[in-house]
């Protein structure tokens, strides 16, 4: 029951300084722009997992702003009308249509920086974001399928005779649970309206030489293991240890 490991190549430039929120960005610095220009334009769509409650910066294609006519950000979120944020260089005006989420803004003035920021990322920000840059040489697109990751809350307890329950509560996507040693297990998933999933794995060990069991939770936000000693007393509970 091994879970897929996070693709760390997508977790670029994530940092945590002082008490500020962690920031994620797929933007390239200026040195990379010229050498990767054609490569970036070919990679029209990027799947991007981002942790909830962090800050995210989404970038337009690396086009020099002096060549620009119009920049448009198109934002399609589940269950909402499409939102567009547009900037016309000639008249220096910005226009927004159906954009109600104040956490999604231009990084700064669009004539200086065309990037979009989400401060902070919420579970409702799952969706598709596309930057369209209109230039005299044609239109250039860059799209992001933003997948908001929610770290599940973990609990492990013994609830009856030689039986332990490991729960990964309200994670996104669903966590995967495995046990050491393997036992006789039943796993249930509970889907919540906000898109998170609670995974509950209950395991029973018939053999008595199993005294300590480990629940391993695999998730895109990181993996954790909890362990517990199986108590001989029916009905007694003992809290888990994390390592």
């Amino acid at each position: 029951e091994g879970a897929a490991q996070p693709n760390n190549s997508l977790m670029l430039q994530t940092s945590k300084e002082n008490h500020a929120l962690a920031s994620s960005s797929l933007c390239m610095d200026e040195k990379q722009i010229t050498q990767n220009y054609s490569k970036v334009l070919a990679e029209v769509n990027t799947s991007w997992p981002v942790k909830m409650a962090t800050n995210a910066v989404l970038c337009c294609p690396p086009i020099a702003l002096r060549n620009l006519i119009i920049i448009t950000w198109e934002i399609i979120l589940r269950g909402q009308p499409s939102c567009t944020k547009a900037y016309r260089k000639e008249t220096n005006e910005t226009k927004e249509t159906n954009c109600t989420d104040e956490r999604i803004t231009w990084v700064s003035r669009p004539d200086q920086n065309s990037d979009l920021q989400i401060r902070p990322v919420a579970i409702t920000h799952d969706g598709y974001y596309r930057c369209i840059m209109v230039t005299p040489d044609g239109n250039f697109h860059r799209g992001y399928h933003l997948q908001v990751l929610v770290t599940p809350e973990l609990t492990l307890f013994q609830n009856r005779n030689r039986t332990a329950v490991c729960k990964a509560v309200a994670g996104k996507p669903a966590a995967q649970i495995s046990w050491i040693p393997e036992g006789d297990c039943a796993t249930k998933q509970e889907y919540w309206s906000n898109g998170t999933v609670t995974v509950k794995s209950t395991c029973h060990w018939e053999v008595h030489n199993v005294s300590t069991v480990t629940c391993h939770v695999s998730h895109l936000t990181g993996n954790k293991s909890l362990y517990i000693e199986l108590l001989p007393v029916p009905g007694a509970k003992k809290s888990a240890k994390l390592y």
Epitope: R160, N161, R162, T163, G183, D184, C185, A186, K188, T202, C203, H204, E206, V207, H208, N209, P234
Partner: antibody, heavy 120, light 108 residues
Framework: QVQLVQSGAEVKKPGASVKVSCKAS?????????MAWVRQAPGQGLEWMGL????????WYAQKFQGRVTMTRDTSTSTVYMELSSLRSEDTAVYYC????????????WGQGTLVTVSS | EIVLTQSPDFQSVTPKEKVTITCQAS??????LLWYQQKPDQSPKLLIK???TLASGVPSRFSGSGSGTDFTLTINSLEAEDAATYYC??????????FGGGTKVEIK
């Protein structure tokens, strides 16, 4: 073929003991699951008697049968046994064995049943 | 000790009719409930595990629902071959796996 085959019918006198066997075949007789015993008196419902851990030999008996029932296993012959002592007429019933994975696959395989008649 | 109370004890039903049998536990058993069908002179046959999961080979007209203390077995369109006694069983704790009293379903 995956099956549980039980011993034949028995007639016993009150106060005697009876030992019913249940032989597993077609699957591994190893740790991880239990063998349970359930009985059914004529025209009555099902009654859980207890179970034995195949790997550990751990025993769980229903309170009603404590002190009168003994469950054992013989891993070399893939057989479990249920012995009931101090028989009385109300112990007349069909006795079933059943394979039991406690959570993932509970009570998923049953023996054909053994009729035990207690009569003077 | 967890006690399972099954109702009704008896039901006489015409073919194609819907049958509902309930099972109530004296305390919460989460979803650890089984439903069986037993025909005369046969061993019990497992229909549903974990309150709502159909056992392999069981027709889809059978369904189970509930969790905690209240559970239901539904036969959506009764067929003649469904005449039998139906039992619920708790498997919440390895130390006690008691059955409900049974519900006899007869075809009119």
């Amino acid at each position: 073929q995956v099956q549980l085959v039980q011993s034949g019918a028995e007639v016993k006198k009150p106060g005697a003991s009876v030992k019913v066997s249940c032989k597993a075949s077609g699957f591994s007789f190893s740790s991880g699951y239990y063998m349970a015993w359930v009985r059914q008196a004529p025209g009555q419902g099902l009654e859980w008697m207890g179970l034995i851990g195949v790997g550990s030999g751990s025993l769980w008996y229903a309170q009603k049968f404590q002190g009168r029932v003994t469950m054992t296993r013989d891993t070399s012959t893939s057989t479990v046994y249920m012995e009931l002592s101090s028989l009385r007429s109300e112990d007349t019933a069909v006795y079933y064995c059943a394979r039991h994975f406690a959570l993932s696959d509970p009570f998923n395989l049953w023996g054909q049943g053994t009729l035990v008649t207690v009569s003077s | 000790e967890i006690v399972l109370t099954q109702s009704p004890d008896f039901q006489s039903v015409t073919p194609k009719e819907k049958v509902t049998i309930t099972c109530q536990a004296s305390e919460s058993i989460d979803s650890y409930l089984l439903w069986y069908q037993q025909k005369p002179d046969q061993s019990p046959k497992l229909l549903i595990k974990q309150a709502s999961t159909l056992a392999s080979g069981v027709p889809s007209r059978f369904s189970g629902s509930g969790s905690g203390t209240d559970f239901t077995l539904t036969i959506n369109s009764l067929e003649a071959e469904d005449a039998a006694t139906y039992y619920c069983q708790n498997y919440y704790d390895i130390s006690s796996n008691d059955f409900g009293g049974g519900t006899k379903v007869e075809i009119k």
